[in-house]
């Protein structure tokens, strides 16, 4: 049966069986800034293509053992949900990543920087269509790196970003502050803000919409079939970065603009249970969660 | 995220260091009364010191970039510091990666061209 | 409801072993770093060791480096302490603890067990 | 020996405030996120305060954290006979690569 998370994105008309457009994002590249991936996974195997930039800080602690399987659990997952033939948003999005988190999950501003300057580089070198970039990560707020994600949102790139796994206010967080990023707090089966322990999404005026971030099924690095679920803003990030490919795909001239102003249209309106969020916040907080357009645009998404 | 609401910094350090003092060594001096600023990760345990992101200001050229960090390391050496360009940035944001003391980000904020410096900091998964 | 459920406290001779489990319910084990926390009789918090999520790494106190070995079982939702070389200053009621958050930010603790007793004693 | 220290014991008539200092160094408080935790005679500790200053669901805003420098400390106002218990920081310490206690302090309500 379809996973709970690609049930709640979808159009009523598509819920019958299975969640299946086949091509969907088929004219968008996505590029995915995070941990290694395992590229040989059945869900993402020819779908992602792994580049050579790597910029990542030693791991902490001297007796950290590096497995291959732990150091890139996080990246595929992600490349999983985003564009994975089973249980991918966008079965049809290739995708590119960029390693720029270690195997304990840590990166730094300075290395994201350069991340995002590699794109912008590959952009104006090999001019293809529309770019989403996946920023499944965050740290304390920073000029410098919301200012490259400005750059690279004029230059007509499409930002997705994680608003942060804090239970605080995002603005506090980059690149989740950045105004020209899509900033997407997570949510979980219930339409609840999800809750990671004392922590949980983030909240506030820099989230633009909220996504399905809890339980989320998609690919294990623990072996080339295997699955697992995993939870997170990262989760969440990685559902609207699927659905802007099909957005995209479908109107690839959209401005960035355009395509917020869809994602918000689109969303389920006042379905949160806002009383999770500290009172100051909750009026503040967009009550939406992500979903892809009806099937009046039966021809345009799901070709 | 959520486009149309002005920035907010919230708890983000800035510290501003006037431009007053002649700097050795200077061919060209930062225009008149504008002042670099130096920023920093709120989350203390995020920090990197020693290494951080000097951003020029906004039409600045890639060879106007290095020059402005070979003249950076000159000056430090002058005062026995040893810095190291990590990397040049250009295409997004003019600038510089440069490990280097603390020490040397008054001297660093008084050059031609720049705009702030950011000391770096940790970004997690999420 | 979180919970967190310690067991095999006892009373043992100096130099023997023993095993301390803690089985955990209620939310994702696997996502969340795990530690040991002590309290000798009438004293304060002494922190023991940790775990990370996926186990890859540990952290120990100096007072019990090379004698005691945290470990996790994910599939099986519990967590475990191996005290070898036992002295009767080990003697104290131990603690497991959920690390706060999901990744490794070294945020505090913030589930605690009811606790288990050890007592080292000839 | 505890590298974290705290004064033995506060005390306060109910309704004053109580403050508990935990002074430590750059390689922990001064550079990792410090918590406090609360422990009644018998209990397990329970979390009041993480990341200096955020109180977890469920702790009422008499809690308050607060650090400057290599010392943190918590704020109890509105004192009640309830809030009688033995008080911890902790924070990670890098040089060690180990978390750490503060060394306790009792709070008595007069």
């Known amino acids: 049966s379809i996973p709970w998370n690609l049930e709640r994105i979808t159009p009523p008309r598509y819920r019958a069986d299975e969640y299946q457009p086949p091509d969907g994002g088929s004219l968008v590249e996505v590029y995915l800034l995070d941990t290694s991936i395992q590229s040989d996974h059945r869900e993402i195997e020819g779908r992602v293509m792994v580049t050579d930039f790597e910029n990542v800080p030693e791991e902490d602690g001297t007796r950290f053992h590096r497995q291959a399987s732990k150091c890139d659990s996080h990246g595929t997952h992600l490349a999983g949900v985003v564009s994975g033939r089973d249980a991918g948003v966008a079965k049809g999005a290739s995708m590119r990543s960029l390693r720029v988190l270690n195997c304990q999950g840590k990166g730094t501003v300075s290395g994201t920087l350069i991340g995002l300057e590699f794109i912008r580089k590959s952009q104006l070198v090999q001019p293809v269509g529309p770019l989403v970039v996946l920023l499944p990560l965050a740290g304390g707020y920073s000029r410098v790196l919301n200012a490259a994600c400005q750059r690279l949102a004029r230059a007509g790139v499409v930002l997705v970003t994680a608003a942060g796994n804090f239970r605080d206010d995002a603005c506090l967080y980059s690149p989740a502050s950045a105004p020209e990023v899509i900033t997407v707090g997570a949510t979980n089966a219930q339409d609840q803000p999800v809750t990671l322990g004392t922590l949980g999404t983030n909240f506030g005026r820099c989230v633009d919409l909220f996504a399905p971030g809890e339980d989320i099924i998609g690919a294990s690095s623990d072996c080339s079939t295997c699955f697992v679920s995993q939870s997170g803003t990262s989760q969440a990030a990685a559902h609207v970065a699927g659905i802007a490919a099909m957005m995209l795909s479908a109107e690839p001239e959209l401005t960035l603009a355009e395509l917020r102003q869809r994602l918000i249209h689109f969303s389920a309106k006042d379905v949160i249970n806002e009383a999770w969020f500290p009172e100051d916040q909750r009026v503040l907080t967009p009550n939406l969660v992500a979903a892809l357009p009806p099937s009046t645009h039966e021809n345009l998404y799901f070709q | 995220g959520a486009m149309g609401q002005e920035d907010e910094d919230g708890d983000y350090e800035e510290l501003v260091l006037a431009l007053r003092s002649e700097e050795d060594g200077l061919a060209e001096a930062p225009e008149h009364g504008t002042t670099a600023t130096f920023h920093r990760c709120a989350k203390d345990p995020w920090r990197l010191p020693g290494t951080y992101v000097v951003v020029l200001k906004e039409e600045t050229h890639l060879s106007q970039s290095e020059r402005t960090a070979r003249r950076l390391q000159a000056q430090a050496a002058r005062r026995g510091y040893l810095t190291k360009i990590l990397h040049v940035f250009h295409g997004l944001l003019p600038g510089f990666l440069v490990k280097m003391s603390g020490d040397l980000l008054e001297l660093a904020l008084k050059l031609p061209h720049v705009d702030y410096i950011e000391e770096d900091s940790s970004v997690f998964a999420q | 409801q979180v919970h967190l459920v310690e067991s095999g406290g006892g009373v043992v001779q100096p130099g023997r072993s023993l095993r301390l489990s803690c089985a955990a319910s209620?939310?994702?084990?696997?996502?969340?770093?795990m530690h040991w926390v002590r309290q000798a009789p009438g004293k304060g918090l002494e922190w023991v060791a940790l775990i990370w999520s996926d186990g890859s790494d540990k952290y120990y106190a100096d007072s019990v480096k090379g004698r005691f070995t945290i470990s996790r079982d994910n599939s099986k939702n519990t967590l475990y302490l191996q005290m070898n070389s036992l002295r009767a200053e080990d003697t104290a009621v131990y603690y497991c603890a959920r690390a706060i958050a999901a990744l490794y930010y070294y945020y505090g603790m913030d589930v605690w067990g009811q606790g288990t007793t050890v007592t080292v004693s000839s | 020996q505890s590298v974290l220290t705290q004064p033995p014991s506060v005390s306060a008539a109910p309704g004053q405030k109580v403050t508990i200092s935990c002074s430590g160094s750059s390689s922990n408080i001064g550079n990792n996120f410090v918590s406090w935790y609360q422990q009644f005679p018998g209990t397990a500790p329970k979390l009041l305060i993480y990341?200096?200053?955020k109180r977890p669901s469920g702790i009422p805003d008499r809690f308050s954290g607060s650090k400057s420098g290599t010392s943190a400390t918590l704020g109890i106002t509105g004192l009640q006979t309830g809030d009688e218990a033995d008080y911890y920081c902790g924070t990670w310490d890098s040089s060690l690569s180990s978390y750490v206690f503060g060394t306790g302090t009792r709070v008595t309500v007069l």
């Open positions: 990341d200096y200053n």
């Open positions: 209620g939310f994702t084990f696997n996502s969340f770093g």
